[in-house]
Interface confidence: low
Amino acid sequence: ELCDDDPPEIPHATFKAMAYKEGTMLNCECKRGFRRIKSGSLYMLCTGNSSHSSWDNQCQCTSSATRNTTKQVTPQPEEQKERKTTEMQSPMQPVDQASLPGHCREPPPWENEATERIYHFVVGQMVYYQCVQGYRALHRGPAESVCKMTHGKTRWTQPQLICTGEMETSQFPGEEKPQASPEGRPESETSCLVTTTDFQIQTEMAATMETSIFTTEYQ
């Protein structure tokens, strides 16, 4: 079952999965100037049995200027560096989820892939949060979020992490900012979501959402 929304946003933090549950999809996205080959897959899919999980389908990118060839170009050092900026600033310490049954490891990069990866998570997926460089963590609980199914709807639990700038004097002990319980934010809880205007949590999800991801391919 696909998660019907994205993991919560924590200001000045990034999240990363240590491994991906079976059923997870990863878009086959190409960097600027390249496109998926005509017959290429839209996404990779984590599949497997009780003993082994792996990514089905291969992502292939070709130059937008080329029609029928699948010209592959090795990424230049600066492109590789650009990719690294979307990853965590330092290694994560939690349990090595990749060794868990029913999980796939991070897929290796493919030639000319986009600098950011787009995942479609499934129920049971866990992601870990870490403050970006220049910010330090103030914990009130686990810095992770899990996609759970409750009352027929999916939701992500709220990570208990606040990232504060090194130079800032934190008001942490007496902060008025309300925090959700680790079991997830209530419908009205929006304090950890950053935007210039208030959020409205929509309570109705499209009934067709589970299948829609497979049905929106156009030529």
């Epitope: 998660c3 019907d4 929304d5 994205d6 919560p8 946003e9 990034t14 999240f15 990363k16 878009n27 996205e29 998926r36 839209l42 996404y43 979307t86 990853e87 950011e116 990866r117 787009i118 995942y119 479609h120 979501l193 950053v194 935007t195 210039t196 205007t197 959020f199 409205q200 949590i201 929509q202 999800m205 499209a206 959402m209 829609s212 991801i213 929106t216 391919e217 156009y218 030529q219």
Partner: nanobody
Amino acid sequence: EVQLVESGGGLVQAGGSLRLSCAASGRTLYSSYGMAWFRQAPGKERDFVGSISRYGTYTSYADSVKDRFTISRDNAKSTVYLQMNNTKPEDTAVYYCAAYTYSGSFYSTVKTHRDEYQYWGQGTQVTVSS
């Protein structure tokens, strides 16, 4: 990449309602995109109206339209909507649909700044008469 086409614009009386649609096409997964509506009045900047996350869970609105406009999406139809109620003459503008690619690591749940959107429609004119 995704292509966006707006429709539903036209002339409406103040206090009336209008529903704009934005259909997405392209060989892509529509649910990879966060969507938004912006508007541009003659001689003015292109301003944020409202945005919606890729699964429709989170929405955000400009103060000027809050409680009057509602943004929604139907991923099965690859379409995002803007329901405009209680329209005012100052809502007159060209309305643009925009999309950004969701990123699984560095991202905002919804984005409100026009520079954050990579894909744009051609726009649809909305005129509110008094």
